[in-house]
Amino acid sequence: APVPPGEDSKDVAAPHRQPLTSSERIDKQIRYILDGISALRKETCNKSNMCESSKEALAENNLNLPKMAEKDGCFQSGFNEETCLVKIITGLLEFEVYLEYLQNRFESSEEQARAVQMSTKVLIQFLQKKAKNLDAITTPDPTTNASLLTKLQAQNQWLQDMTTHLILRSFKEFLQSSLRALRQM
C-alpha cells in the first residue's frame, strides 16, 4: 500500500520545509484515498465485467450511498461553506459501513482496502477539527450499520461484486465533489 500522507520519506529528508496547512493536509489526504480507490477499482474490473455495467443496472439498487445534491451547498451555484462541510463529514461517516464491507472483498489488494478505510477515518478527524457546527453532524446508528453489513455479506456473489463496484464508484464521485468544494473554502 502507498505510504499515507505525512509519512513519506521526502518529509524526513526535508525538515526545513514549511509544514502543511490544514487545507493542504486535507487535500493531500483525499487525493491519497482516491489513489487507493483507483487501485481497488482496477482489481474489481480485472476480476469481472462489472465495470461495463450500465448506469441503469447500477441505478436499480437499494443501497443508500451518500451523494452530493444541490441543497448540500457544495456546488459552485449556491455554495455554502458550513452546510457543505457538514454534508462532507456526514457523508464520510455514512460511507464507513460500506468501507468496512469492502474489507473482505479483495484478494490481491487487501492492504489497499484497509488503507482506504483507515485514511478515511483520519480524513474525518481532520474535517471535524475544521467544522464549527459539529452538532449538525449526525452519526449513523451502529445497530443499523451492523444489520446492513450482515445483509450485504449475505448477498450472492454476483450481487456482492456489483455492490463492491458501486461503492467504489460512488465513493470516488463523493470524494471528487468534496475535493472541489473544499478547495473553495
Partner: antibody, heavy 119, light 111 residues
Amino acid sequence: EVQLQQSGPELVKPGASVKMSCKASGYTFTSYVMHWVKQKPGQGLEWIGYINPYNDGTKYNEKFKGKATLTSDKSSSTAYMELSSLTSEDSAVYYCAREGYGNLERDCWGQGTSVTVSS
Amino acid sequence: DIVLTQSPASLAVSLGQRATISCRASESVDGFGISFMNWFQQKPGQPPKLLIYVASNQGSGVPARFRGRGRGTDFSLNIHPMEEDDSAMYFCQQSKEVPWTFGGGTKLEIK
C-alpha cells in the same frame, strides 16, 4: 458442460459420521461458491451452507452449525460435506449446488447423495 | 431470512390447459435489475430440475411451455399447454442471499 457428480448412497449407524463428496467439472472450480441443500423424504428443501473454494470461506445455516462441516480440495475440484453425530433426523438426500452468476450463469445441482441412519 | 409463500399447495389441471403457480417473497429478491427467483420441478426419486432461473430465463432443455414471470416480491410459473409429463412437485427458490429459501411446494396433477 457444467457437471456435479456426487458420491453414492450411505447407510450409517446412529452416532457415527459420514463424509460425502461433490466432484465438479466443466468450469473453474475456484470461481464459484458451492452450496449444500438437505431434503428429507417427502419434504421440502433446506439450505445447509456454502463454501467458497477460492479461499475456503464458509457460511452455515445456524441450524447446521456443529452438524455439518464443509471443505474443498482445489486439486481435485471436489467439495465435501461431513455430517457428525448422526440421528434418524439426518436421514435425507443431500444435494450440492453450484451458485450461478447474475443472469449469465445459472445454478447447477448434483444428483444427490442419500443418507440413511439406522441401527 | 426471506420467506417464500407458494400457492396453491396442490393443483389438478386438464391436459392442454394452463397451470399457474404463484410464489410470494417476504421481501424483494431483486438486485441491480435482476430478480433472483428460480423454479424447480421434482419427480419422485429424482433430484430437483431447474426450469427457470432469475425469474424468466429458461434452463437448458426446458420446453417453451414453461414460462416464469414477475419481479420484486411476486412471481409465477405458467405451464401451457399442460402435458402428461408435467405431473410433479414444483418449488420456487430465492438465491438473492443466504440462507437460500424455498417455497413449500405445489403438487401438480393431471385432472
